[in-house]
């Protein structure tokens, strides 16, 4: 989508919503190429805020603060034009994050979908947030934005997402913001990691020794399928973490990951995924559930010799 | 319930300093923006500027840029206006409003009286 | 800047009359966002100003419904449907789409 005839396309990298502190590069691309250009800040004076600074391929705006957010246009250079200069660009809005409280997001369902479902991310704040704002991590279009709605003194807004493919997989988070100053945002939401399931085919889980237990005695899930995941995901029923290890190749060719669950104390129903580095957030088929039992005195808990993983950082690359 | 009470009245001459408080209670201060607000002898309102409580960023009209200076003190839920150098035009009342959201100015201080005088 | 003109400068009204007080914009008061944030304050004799309308007609809380809002673009009106004595004091429009924001120079109700 580059600039028609004599328009430049103006893009920001890696994305239109910077933090505060943070730095952005505007690139104006113009007949099929990055020219000199000129860039224009639209506000209340209409002239550039780079007043006679010429720039090429890219301009690498920061540390950014909130005089920054706005709308922006660059010019590329027409050298044998009257004015020497091409029409404006298209508009490009930057917003600035951390201008106020975070608010928060939560997936409903939840965050674990199956391909094809439709999450509603919802995005809240005790702050009265006139807009919130939705982005996905990586993405540099324009995040989405809703109006928000106010009750009983909270603000928000819900984001219907789907039908899932693997493209909406990723980490999102939400911002807020008011009418004082639209393109300051707030402080980004904690991030949420949308996860999609059923794109492969399910590894197989079992319980070493074995599904049956007694009380204090240890217990090793292990996860393994002939397809060469490079992650493996342990989730149980009824707790919002979810482990996960390196998937080792084995000598018959599988790939597999052993969970120490530490001494039995506790039983559970538990189903594994496998993913790959390149598609974090995509996940295969559920396992078969496995039912671990536990005979004698359980107790309320399981303790992990394993910590559980955030409930955010799954969509990152274990490294 | 909410409220927002600031300083008593200021008898002050030219070329001096004065600091007016505004102390924000029966709210999350840092949620909402607040807003400065003069009113001269007998005039109608005016709209000063405001600062962001959460990042302590002010921004002023242009007609207050220069003399005044919004700050905060977060942990005392309060915000401050300092006018420096005072001069006999800024004999006024002076209101602190909270905003955010929908509403510019939904609760308001009582107003503080300066009288500027030689 | 944007100049808010109200009219009229002074309104005497009977109590239990219909007050009506128009306020026009320089500009349209259309904010990026789409919202039009208009806003209507009473100011009795010696108080701060109190906050009755905004967004043009959304009635702020404990303002009773005797007050209405309504208009867009650059012109804008506040209704009293019935005058009762605490609604006399000074009326202000003010707007909050364009930096700087501003107020209205007032409507003074008061009892014919």
């Known amino acids: 989508l580059m600039g028609g005839q004599d328009k430049p396309f103006l893009s920001a990298r890696p994305s239109t919503v910077v933090p505060r502190g943070g730095h952005v590069a505007l690139q104006c691309h113009y007949r099929r190429g990055f020219n000199n250009f000129m860039l224009y800040k639209e506000d209340r004076s209409h002239v550039p805020i780079f007043h006679g600074r010429i720039f090429q391929e890219s301009f690498i705006m920061g540390p950014v603060t909130p005089a920054h957010a706005g709308t922006y246009r660059c010019r590329g250079s027409r050298p044998h034009s009257l004015t020497g200069w091409s029409a404006p660009s298209n508009p490009l809005v930057i917003m600035v994050t951390g201008n106020h409280r975070k608010p928060s997001l939560l997936a409903h369902p939840g965050p674990l979908l199956k391909s094809g479902e439709t999450v509603i991310l919802q995005c809240w704040s005790d702050v009265m947030f006139e807009h919130f704002f939705l982005h996905r991590e990586g993405i540099s279009e324009d995040p989405s934005r809703l109006v928000g709605q106010i009750h009983d003194g909270v603000s928000k807004a819900n984001f219907s997402i789907g039908p899932l493919m693997p493209v909406l997989a990723g980490t999102y988070r939400c911002y807020g913001s008011v009418p004082h100053s639209p393109y300051q945002l707030s402080a980004p939401s904690d991030p949420l990691d949308i996860v999609i399931t059923g794109l492969y085919e399910k590894p197989s889980l079992s319980a070493q020794p074995g599904p049956t237990v007694q009380a204090g005695e240890n217990v090793t899930l292990s996860c393994s399928s002939w397809s060469s995941y490079d992650i493996y995901h342990l989730s149980r029923e009824g707790e919002a973490h979810e482990r996960r290890l390196r998937a080792v190749p084995k000598v018959n060719r599988t790939f597999q990951a052993d969970f120490p669950l530490g001494p039995a104390t506790h039983g559970g129903t538990y189903r594994c995924f496998g993913s790959f580095r390149a598609l974090p957030c995509v996940w295969s088929n559920s396992s078969d559930p496995l039912l671990v039992s536990v005979t004698g005195n359980p107790s309320s808990s399981w303790p992990s010799p394993t910590e559980p993983s955030s409930k955010s950082g799954i969509c990152r690359h274990l490294h | 319930q909410i409220q927002l009470v600031q300083s008593g009245p200021e008898l002050k001459k030219p070329g001096e300093t004065v600091k007016i408080s505004c102390k924000a209670s029966?709210?999350?201060?840092?949620?909402?923006?607040m807003n400065w607000v003069k009113q001269a002898p007998g005039k109608g309102l005016k709209w000063m500027g405001w600062?962001?409580?959460?990042?302590?960023?002010?921004t002023y009209a242009d007609d207050f840029k220069g003399r005044f200076a919004f700050s905060l003190e977060t942990s005392a839920t309060t915000a401050y206006l300092q006018i420096n150098n005072l001069k006999n035009e800024d004999m006024a009342t002076y209101f602190c409003?909270?905003?955010?959201?929908?509403?510019?100015?939904?609760?308001w201080g009582q107003g503080t009286t300066l009288t500027v005088s030689s | 800047d944007v100049l808010m003109t109200q009219t009229p400068l002074s309104l005497p009204v009977s109590l239990g009359d219909q007050a009506s007080i128009s306020c026009r914009s320089s500009?349209?008061?259309?904010?990026?966002?789409?919202?039009?944030?208009l806003e209507w304050y009473l100011q009795k004799p010696g108080q701060s100003p109190k906050l009755l309308i905004y967004?043009?007609?959304n009635r702020f809380s404990g303002v009773p419904d005797r007050f209405s809002g309504s208009g867009s673009g650059t012109d804008f009106t506040l209704k009293i449907s019935r005058v009762e004595a605490e609604d006399l004091g000074v009326y202000y429009c003010?707007?909050?789409?364009?930096?700087?924001?501003?107020f209205g120079g007032g409507t003074k109700l008061e009892i014919k």
């Open positions: 409003s909270r905003s955010f959201g929908s509403t510019y100015g939904d609760y």
């Open positions: 029966g709210y999350t201060f840092t949620n909402y923006g």
């Open positions: 600062i962001n409580t959460y990042t302590g960023e002010p």
């Open positions: 500009q349209t008061i259309v904010h990026s966002n789409g919202n039009t944030y």
């Open positions: 967004k043009v007609s």
């Open positions: 003010f707007q909050g789409s364009h930096v700087p924001w501003t």
